[in-house]
């Protein structure tokens, strides 16, 4: 999906209003310095591409974040403010249902969500130069 045509200001407002708080809740009990940010993004469409990938694609050691509250809200925000996003996700959602696993918070998942927090922060500051 090409995130170029999303309403970035609305997605930012959704993040600041509620998604950010859910990410903090997920990470509660973890020191903010515990993980290094290794994933970066260069502009808002790129940030959303990376956010979608880290949130919804299973990775080694973290099978699924998709049923977490922050993930459900992320999916909803993209569906509302990225034209045509919902239609592209129908097949992906059906595939995800087949391989759904029980929720387990592993250290790898915590690291992944820490990366997500960094991507979201970067999304909210699009005019900053890349380090």
């Amino acid at each position: 999906y090409d995130f170029t045509n999303c309403d970035f200001e609305k997605i930012k407002a959704a993040y600041l209003s509620t998604i950010s708080k859910d990410l903090i809740t997920y990470m509660s009990g973890t020191k903010s310095t515990e993980f290094n940010n290794t994933v970066s993004c260069s502009n808002r469409p790129h940030c959303l591409t990376e956010i979608q990938s880290l949130t919804f694609n299973p990775t080694a050691g973290c099978a699924s974040l998709a049923k977490e509250m922050f993930a459900m809200k992320t999916k909803a925000a993209l569906a509302i403010w990225c034209p045509g996003y919902s239609e592209t996700q129908i097949n992906a959602t059906q595939a995800m249902k087949k391989r759904r696993k029980r929720k387990v918070t592993t250290n790898k998942c915590l690291e992944q969500v820490s990366q997500l927090q960094g991507l979201w922060r970067r999304f909210n500051r699009p005019l900053l130069k890349q380090q």
């Epitope: 959704a14 209003s17 509620t18 809200k73 909803a76 925000a77 509302i80």
Partner: nanobody, 132 residues
Framework: QVQLVESGGGLVQAGGSLRLSCAAS????????ITWFRQAPGKEREGVAY????????YYADSVKGRFTISSDNAKNTVYLQMDSLKPEDTAVYYC?????????????????????????WGQGTQVTVSS
């Protein structure tokens, strides 16, 4: 240009009723979500009730569930808030607000409808005072 005009506020005794109206113009009403917000002195603006003019889906704040009813007349481009069993704590300025994409994505909007930062268009507000 987009205009939202509220009316129907006033002074009412506890236990009484009021019906607020929000008349809209300047946009495709049928696709929009309209939400009633309220703001009491010294408090944050809070979402009270949402309606999608696209499919009629409604959401309510827990504090008003069972007492307030939101409805829409698409032919008149007007949204109503029927407020029954009013309490002194309902005293506030009531605003209606419109958003263009939450109307056609009402199920996804369950997470976001009550956050004022997501709305583009606002009315000027109408005062509701409930005396004890």
């Amino acid at each position: 240009q987009v205009q939202l005009v509220e009316s129907g506020g006033g002074l009412v005794q506890a236990g009484g009723s009021l019906r607020l109206s929000c008349a809209a113009s300047g946009f495709t009403f049928d696709d929009y979500a309209i939400t009633w917000f309220r703001q009491a002195p010294g408090k944050e603006r809070e979402g009270v009730a949402y309606i999608s003019n696209f499919d009629g889906m409604t959401y309510y704040a827990d504090s008003v569930k069972g007492r307030f009813t939101i409805s829409s007349d698409n032919a008149k481009n007007t949204v109503y808030l029927q407020m029954d069993s009013l309490k002194p704590e309902d005293t506030a300025v009531y605003y209606c607000a419109a958003e263009g994409r939450m109307g056609t994505h009402s199920r996804d909007s369950v997470y976001f409808w009550a956050f004022s930062a997501l709305y583009d268009h606002w009315g000027q507000g109408t005062q509701v005072t409930v005396s004890s």
